[in-house]
């Protein structure tokens, strides 16, 4: 095909799993160059105004080459950088962090239940989010319904654009995502030693354009390559478009179709007017919502990464487009983080560590509002346990942008699944508010007093009431209302159509109307304004809390040195499911009042904790609490009972070091640790280190 070509062949050395920097770079250099040259081609095609189909093919090839480069970069990284997923998942399932939903009925893929530990962790991640964003920025939090009437999602573009192609096993009805299945099938064919160079080249070309194929092209490819169900070997149905939203009907009549929301954002846009009023009509302001969203993934296969019901936390920051400047940007300007700009991606470069202030100054990040949120997102993610070295912000390339966005940066984390998107930070421009305003005829705008009155050129539709009334009778009112709220950009576009073709079409409330020259013309005049109407731009940070949580699992999972069986999660104290454990060294009755007293005091201090008075050795009990990420451990030992003042030991999970302090002090120490007011190093500086028992009893708390 015209603008696609198989990615260049890998040097032999590329099969090695990890190597030194120079060796790795030697392997990556040709792949970087291949991306770069494809980037040049895309640019040239655009310059030459080549047909869109050719640009799309070239872009698909660019993305394919990018994927090859990225996969190789990941493969060349040191093996100890990658978590033992099987071991981690065993711990997560065994300790009931989460499990497949409806497990006793055989489970449903893409649906999960969180157990006590997972639930506590998730709540803490959400609570930290509230403090970090809602409280810090004085954001207006709302809670909207999940059920959404169809017209809302029609207007937002989700009904038309939120779809994938799907194929079905003709015998058992099992569904597969067409692109995923075709990709896996072609990769299998290509790995066959008997596959000729020409055939391989042809298949690579198909893979490169996978994102661009329409329904019929996909159907032909399934036939050409004889794709069958990978599970049963049965024939597959032709691909059909499958909308990823869960459809339902609101009310018993079945005449009000709706969907479970695919994102929480729409609820905020629809309440914009009320929120603006609540904010005394002033921009900028932000609104947020935390709640579940739903996507009917065709065949979810990646654990918590791809699910059908998931918790999102979304902020919509409404800003005057002429004032995209954040007063608090300086607070984050000195952060250094990995940025992977669109330019770097098409040049085959890696993400590069940059000071945020420099990134905005150099135009890598468009404005300080976007820059501020990127900085705050970074601080939040690292606060909850994501490793800064496995976190990058990747800018969407022009062709990847969602239908509503004009610039977008994703926070991506490096996991055993590769780089996964965990937060999207999109500049949605004025897409949503404009769409909903046009559909509902409710102007979703803010008013801004002008320093000086100004004379402006006005462009309006001037409809002929008579002609429209004659043509559309009782629907004429609909047409007139629609025409009254069209913006200048839209009017100018329609005027061009009117001049070129003598007519244009509008769509409102599900009805289509054709307007001809005798029904409408365009009026231009001047008027003096004292206030200015502003359609706010929207910066939207959107957090996938399940993916964040999964990343935290991977980035904090460790195996104790020298003991493969002892695993633990080093959750930061602020999100740890339990802040501390209370462990009596013995089941002796005289220990119990101290356990009770300490537990009650911890509760009074708001410190979630777990009492483990089971009979196992103290070392085994530490291991058990470490395994679920309990941040600290208080041990009531014989010295607690036998000596005054009554003291106990406090153990840090990560270093396994201990100090000794009075029982009465421990709740506030743990509370301060959990809130991040002090660090373990501060605690060690203030209290004596504890290295063994003083009473000579047989059972010690040394590990």
């Amino acid at each position: 095909s015209a603008a696609s070509c198989p990615p260049i062949s890998l040097p032999a050395a590329a099969s090695r799993s990890s190597m030194d920097g120079a060796g790795a770079e030697e392997v990556l250099a040709p792949l970087r160059l291949a991306v770069r040259q494809q980037g040049d081609l895309v640019r040239k095609l655009k310059e030459d105004k080549a047909p869109q189909v050719d640009v799309d093919k070239a872009v698909a090839e660019l993305k394919a080459r990018k994927r090859v480069l990225e996969a190789k970069e990941l493969a060349l990284q040191p093996k100890d950088d990658i978590v033992d997923r099987a071991k981690m998942e065993d711990t997560l399932k065994r300790r009931f962090f989460y499990d497949q939903a409806f497990a006793i009925y055989g489970g449903v893929s893409g649906l999960y239940d969180f157990g006590p530990v997972g639930c506590a962790l998730k709540n803490n991640i959400i609570q930290t989010w509230r403090q970090h964003f809602i409280q810090e920025e004085q954001i207006l939090e709302i809670d909207c319904t999940m059920l959404t009437p169809e017209p809302v999602l029609k207007t937002s573009g989700h009904v038309d654009k939120f779809a994938d192609f799907m194929v079905k096993d003709v015998k058992n009805g099992e569904c597969f995502r067409a692109d995923h299945l075709l990709k896996a099938h072609l990769q299998k064919l290509m790995s066959d030693k008997k596959c000729s160079v020409e055939k391989k080249s042809e298949m690579e070309s198909v893979l490169a354009q996978l994102d661009n194929y329409g329904q019929q092209e996909l159907a032909d490819l399934f036939v050409n390559y004889n794709v069958k169900s990978p599970i049963t070997g049965n024939d597959l149905s032709p691909p059909v478009s499958f909308n990823l939203m869960f459809k339902t009907f609101i009310g018993p009549g079945g005449n009000m179709p709706g969907y479970l929301r695919p994102e929480t954002a729409q609820g905020i846009f629809l309440n914009f007017k009320r929120l603006l009023e609540f904010n005394q009509g002033k921009l900028p302001f932000a609104a947020a919502q935390i709640g579940n969203s739903f996507r009917n993934e065709i065949s979810p296969r990646s654990g918590l990464i791809r699910v059908r019901e998931f918790t999102m936390a979304e902020i919509e920051h409404f800003v005057d487009p002429s004032e995209k400047d954040h007063p608090k940007f300086q607070n984050v300007a000195d952060l250094h983080l990995y940025l992977y700009s669109a330019k770097a991606q098409v040049s085959g470069q890696s993400a590069r560590k940059m000071r945020l202030g420099d990134a905005v100054e150099q135009g890598v990040i468009n404005n300080t509002v976007l820059g501020y949120f990127i900085g705050r997102i970074y601080l939040y993610l690292t606060k909850v346990g994501i490793s800064p070295d496995k976190l990058r912000f990747r800018q969407h390339m022009e062709n990847e942008m969602a239908h509503y966005a004009c610039d977008c940066w994703d926070a991506e984390s490096k996991t055993s699944y590769g780089w996964i998107e965990i937060v999207g930070c999109a500049d949605r421009s004025c897409y949503d508010l404009s769409c909903h305003a046009r559909a509902t005829k409710v102007p979703l705008v803010a008013e801004k007093p002008l320093k000086e009155p100004k004379t402006v050129n006005v462009v309006q539709f001037e409809p002929s009431k008579g002609a429209i009334g004659k043509a559309y009778k009782k629907d004429a009112k609909l047409v007139m209302e629609y025409l009254a709220i069209c913006d200048e950009c839209y009017i100018t576009e329609m005027e061009m159509l009117l001049n070129e073709k003598g007519e244009f079409t509008i769509e409102t409330e599900g009805k289509t109307f054709q307007l001809t020259k005798d029904m409408i013309n365009v009026k231009r005049f001047q008027k003096t304004l004292y206030v200015e109407e502003v359609v706010p731009n929207v910066i939207e940070p959107s957090f996938g809390l399940g993916r964040i949580m999964y990343t935290v699992f991977e980035h904090t999972f460790h195996v104790r040195e020298g003991d493969e069986q002892r695993t633990f999660f080093s959750f930061p104290a602020v999100v740890a499911p339990f802040k501390c454990s209370v462990l009596p060294l013995s089941q002796n009755q005289e220990f119990m009042p101290f356990v009770k007293e300490l537990s009650e005091a911890l509760t009074r201090h708001g410190v979630s904790h777990k009492v483990d008075d089971s009979s196992g050795s103290i070392g085994r009990r530490y291991a058990r609490t470490d395994e679920i990420g309990v941040a600290f451990g208080v041990t009531i030992d014989f010295d607690t009972v036998n000596k005054t003042p009554h003291t106990a030991t406090l153990r840090d999970r990560d270093s396994m070091r201990q100090i000794r302090a009075e029982i009465s002090e421990l709740p506030s120490i743990v509370q301060d640790l959990a809130n991040g007011n002090i660090t373990w190093a501060d605690v060690e500086a203030r209290y004596p280190l504890f290295e063994g028992q003083e009473t000579g009893k047989k059972e010690t708390i040394e590990e």
């Epitope: 015209a2 070509c5 260049i8 062949s9 040709p30 160059l33 040049d40 040239k44 160079v197 080249s201």
Partner: antibody, heavy 116, light 110 residues
Framework: EVQLLESGGGLVQPGGSLRLSCAAS????????MSWVRQAPGKGLEWVSA????????YYADSVKGRFTISRDNSKNTLYLQMNSLRAEDTAVYYC?????????WGQGTLVTVSS | QSVLTQPPSASGTPGQRVTISCSGS????????VTWYQQLPGTAPKLLIY???HRPSGVPDRFSGSKSGTSASLAISGLRSEDEADYYC???????????FGGGTKLTVL
Amino acid sequence: EVQLLESGGGLVQPGGSLRLSCAASGFTFSGYDMSWVRQAPGKGLEWVSAIYSDSGSTYYADSVKGRFTISRDNSKNTLYLQMNSLRAEDTAVYYCARNTALFDYWGQGTLVTVSS
Amino acid sequence: QSVLTQPPSASGTPGQRVTISCSGSSSNIGSNYVTWYQQLPGTAPKLLIYANNHRPSGVPDRFSGSKSGTSASLAISGLRSEDEADYYCGAWDASLSGYVFGGGTKLTVL
């Protein structure tokens, strides 16, 4: 309008050195990879060298490796080719061209003659 | 000795269609795009076809390119006297880590 203008050619003795320059205008020079291509009198085109937009990587033909050095100064919109240990077979018109595998704009060339 | 092989010469009468072939290997044409350049007498080369079959703006649609496997060809239909020039094919070569040209084909319009 995109323009590439080579300079610095001339007569040089075998073993000598020469530095060619290519002044670019009409496009964002710092956003493009650049190359040098040469053509011996009455012969075909031969690729010489290429450099990334940020100077991060350079490539050379085997025939010039170790003797020629490609570089650029984005603040001056200029591409350079430092040629050392010149040989008679390096005699050619040297062109600078935009990109590394899709030479969409070429300069008019500068003649380098290596002769004693 | 060029890495890509082109016939040294080709000819045709005005209005005729001529094709110029270019053959290489899996490390160049087989795995990368082919580009064609036109060099009119006494001038610098000019981009004629890129990405196997794309014409830059300003190049007449009489010129077309194609590629199959490890070979490529340039077709010129409706030959005109001003098409008399040297034509070069080129492609990036992955195993040489460099760009390679064909030896050039001198087209004569009779």
